[in-house]
Interface confidence: medium
């Protein structure tokens, strides 16, 4: 329960007052305001929006609102030398060229500064060669090609469909396979839901629609030229050759109309199985190269984009805490968009704006939160989480000592079916308790709680009567706070029905068709799902900032640690002979998890019983809770990924969007049967078990009685 005694406020200023102040109509109005022109990172338009948000947050009543700027590496197409892909004949003549732009949606024909589709940070180049279709370009797709089908991608241009994994992982995999260029496309199987019309008549992707996006492999570094440190006025910048995470081969995205013209001519091997076929009326032959009649034709890429150091602007708003001003609860989401940002990010930014307004209203009536709340409008998220990461690098010493929690606020919707939450186990009980108090917006659940509709539509695979809550991965601005700094983090949004909709993300993701009208006509006409997401995000922030005892339950971490230990052990046990040969034991890890469970249980008992009127003891117990997430941080980081320092969770090495548990052990075990030196490989598994066991034990000890 939230308690307000310590902040000396009138009874009406509680969670209910905050939630009642949130209005769907305001979110709608803010979304419209934020989506009328493009707000690409590094542009004047996005700077102006930053200043507008700064001004409005001040009006709403925050104590201070500042712009924090950084000069980071961004990437843009060349305005006079467009990017495209050709089919060329034996004489080198271009007999087919891909589109240079997306046909603009109705009402936006005269909007200027719509950046054409491009893969941000692609190097320049004009490679030509035979095409190889590589499915989703996942690790397992390249295993299938190289190991089973004996197809060599070296010197080839590969064409991969978007979906399943982060596009940067696709490019990395293609580079490792020796490809000299990558074409990314949206297949209707993944971005066209059956029975739904294309935009503007529905929410499906038209054939000329294209997904933009960065193709970096930063592994949490932030600005590629200043890893570990803020890109400020006196920064020392790496040379471009030493920059972190840049791709080495040209990459370009296309829509399915253009993809059809490339794929229809493909020859060579047939697709290995039905999982390699999309929904275009083409054979999905793997190649290499075109079939008989077209075998002399090649594909040529023309990429002329440039990387430029450019100024970006975060907006940082502060609502000072009345009792513990040195404890920070952060609500942050990005402001920059690829084009109009109808969903990504402005459906989230509009919700943040309304949350700020509600908190401001309470503050104007004399209320303050117990702890300080920081609000952030991040820049350059689309270019690699740059704004949030640079700010966290600049403020890392404050954050690691004072950071209680980070709640992320990108897109509020990716569907309108049910709630989706990813968070640290410390927040499970907070999310459960909060959603039990909120009304469900879903049809058929009138008068029922959000918890009830969410649990019914998205049940936990492990615990009956509970909803699914997923692991945090990456691909959004919580990354630096959770994976690098070990600050308890969470995110919530409304999502689609994953059972019936197998497409990846939402069809119009990062296209020109992601407009205000897309949301208002097709996803959330009443803005009731946006309001629910505002209540969840805002409610979490309110509780984290205002409850006397932090709403973290360390016992939930104990439960998942056991689950993750069981899972990684079962993966290792697929190699029983090697485990015996190399004396691989998980005893230390299971012992540490057992100790953690017992100590967490005792801590929770003490938490019920201690004297909450004693401010020193209260602060001590809260600090143990706050620093528990921090205790899972290994200062040395994961192998070859120094900015991923959380030992329990990291973004998957094969898909940045997905979270992996015990990632150090997992990566050491991955494809271990193919390692040239098994003794060395199993030695690394043993080292990673040691690191994990030590970390879990060390974290457990932070919960023990202090003396």
């Amino acid at each position: 329960k939230s308690s307000n005694e310590a902040t000396n406020i009138t009874p009406k200023h509680n969670m209910k007052a905050f939630l009642d102040e949130l209005k769907a109509e305001n979110i709608k109005k803010f979304l419209y305001n934020f989506t009328q022109i493009p707000h690409l990172a590094g542009t004047e338009q996005n700077f102006q929006l930053a200043k507008q948000i700064q001004s409005q947050w001040k009006e709403f009543g925050l104590d201070s609102v500042e712009l924090a700027h950084y000069d980071v590496l961004l990437s843009y197409p060349n305005k006079t030398h467009p990017n495209y892909i050709s089919i060329i004949n034996e004489d080198g003549n271009e007999i087919f060229n891909t589109s240079l732009f997306e046909p603009p949606p109705p009402g936006y024909e005269n909007v200027s500064d719509i950046v054409p589709p491009f893969s941000a940070f692609s190097p320049q180049g004009m490679p030509e060669g035979d095409l190889v279709y590589v499915n989703y370009a996942r690790t397992e797709d390249f295993f299938k090609l190289e190991r089973d089908m004996k197809i060599n991608c070296s010197g080839k241009i590969v064409i991969a469909r978007y979906g399943k994994v982060f596009r940067g992982n696709k490019v990395k995999n293609a580079q490792l396979a020796g490809a000299k260029g990558v074409i990314l496309y949206s297949d209707p199987a993944d971005y066209f839901a059956p029975g739904v019309k294309s935009y503007p008549d529905g929410w499906n992707l038209p054939g000329g629609g294209v997904q933009r996006g960065n193709i970096l492999n930063l592994n949490g570094a932030g600005d590629p030229l200043t890893p570990g440190y803020p890109a400020n006025e006196y920064a020392y910048r790496r040379g471009i050759a030493e920059a972190v995470g840049l791709p080495s081969i040209p990459v370009h995205p296309i829509g399915y109309y253009d993809a059809q013209k490339l794929l229809e001519k493909m020859g060579g091997s047939a697709p290995p199985d039905s999982s390699w076929r999309g929904s275009l009326k083409v054979p999905y032959n793997v190649g290499p190269g075109f079939t008989g009649n077209f075998s002399t034709q090649k594909v040529k890429m023309h990429i002329h984009s440039t990387n430029e150091v450019t100024r970006i602007y975060n907006v940082i708003g502060t609502l000072r805490g009345a009792v513990e001003p040195d404890r920070y609860v952060i609500l942050g989401g990005h402001r920059d968009s690829w084009v109009f940002g109808g969903i990504d990010p402005q459906s989230g930014a509009a919700v943040v704006h309304e949350i700020v307004r509600s908190f401001g209203t309470l503050k104007k009536e004399g209320w303050r939160p117990r702890r300080t709340i920081l609000f952030a409008s991040w820049d350059a998220e689309e270019f690699g989480l740059l704004g949030s990461t640079e700010w966290a690098e600049e403020n890392s010493r404050l954050l690691q000592e004072r950071g209680v929690a980070y709640i992320n606020a990108d897109s509020s919707i990716e569907g309108n079916y049910t709630l989706r939450v990813d968070c640290t186990p410390l927040m499970y009980s907070l999310v459960h308790n909060l959603t039990k108090e909120l009304k469900s917006p879903d049809e058929g659940f009138e008068g029922k709680s959000l918890y009830e509709s969410w649990t019914k539509k998205s049940p936990s695979p492990e615990f009956s009567g509970m909803p699914r809550i997923s692991k945090l991965g990456s691909g959004n601005d919580f990354e630096v706070f959770f994976q690098r700094l070990g600050i308890a983090s969470g995110r919530a949004r409304y999502t689609k029905n994953w059972e019936t909709n197998k497409f990846s993300g939402y069809p119009l993701y990062h296209s020109v068709y992601e407009t205000y009208e897309l949301v208002e006509k097709f996803y959330d006409p009443m803005f009731k799902y946006h309001l629910t997401v505002a209540q969840v995000r805002g409610g979490m922030v309110f509780e984290l900032a205002n409850s006397i005892v932090l709403p973290f339950d360390c016992r939930d971490y104990a439960v998942v640690l056991r689950k993750y230990a069981d899972k990684i052990y079962s993966i290792s046990m697929k190699h029983p002979q090697e485990m015996k040969t190399y004396s691989v034991s998980f005893d230390s890890l299971f012992s540490a998890v057992k100790n953690f469970t017992e100590i967490a249980s005792k801590f929770s008992e003490r938490l019920q019983d201690f004297d909450k009127s004693n401010p020193i003891v209260l602060r001590m117990m809260n600090d143990q809770l706050m620093f528990l997430e921090r205790a899972f941080i290994d200062p040395l980081g994961l192998p070859d990924r120094p900015f991923y320092r959380h030992v329990i969770y990291a973004p998957s090495s094969h898909n940045k969007y997905a979270g992996e548990s015990f990632p150090g052990i997992y990566d050491a075990l991955f494809d271990i049967e193919s390692k040239v030196d098994p003794s060395k490989a199993w030695g690394e598994v043993k080292r990673q078990i040691y690191v994990a066991a030590f970390t879990v034990q060390a974290a457990a000890e932070t919960l023990s009685e202090v003396a």
Epitope: S99, P188, F192, P194, K197, G207, Y257, K261, K281
Partner: nanobody, 119 residues
Framework: EVQLVESGGGLVQPGGSLRLSCAAS????????MYWVRQAPGKGLEWVAN????????YYVDSVKGRFTISRDNAKNSLYLQMNSLRAEDTAVYYC????????????WGQGTLVTVSS
């Protein structure tokens, strides 16, 4: 509801010209590739020409190359087929079609317009 209405057919002498039009409604015309398909008396369907959604790519069956020109006006939701140097073997019912490149998504056809090339 998707509607495609062809017009412009008729009787023409060999060597003459005709311009077929197709008025589209009920869908976002500018998002789709469009096709002309024909059916000669007693024969099967034959693809004639197609054009991409923005009009930058055009493809023709070999027998009409250099004589027929497909075009579109997205502002008017209209598709055209300019037919020059007509021959007797061009006699057919000409259909405007909105095919789908996607497996499982239905295509749409107009009612057709008859072109008769005869002296």
């Amino acid at each position: 509801e998707v509607q495609l209405v062809e017009s412009g057919g008729g009787l023409v002498q060999p060597g003459g010209s005709l311009r077929l039009s197709c008025a589209a409604s009920g869908f976002t015309f500018s998002s789709y590739w469009m096709y002309w398909v024909r059916q000669a008396p007693g024969k099967g369907l034959e693809w004639v020409a197609n054009i991409n959604h923005i009009g930058s790519e055009k493809y023709y069956v070999d027998s009409v190359k250099g004589r027929f020109t497909i075009s579109r006006d997205n502002a008017k939701n209209s598709l055209y087929l300019q037919m020059n140097s007509l021959r007797a073997e061009d006699t057919a019912v000409y259909y405007c079609a909105r095919d789908s490149l996607i497996v499982g998504e239905r295509g749409y056809w107009g009612q057709g317009t008859l072109v008769t090339v005869s002296s």
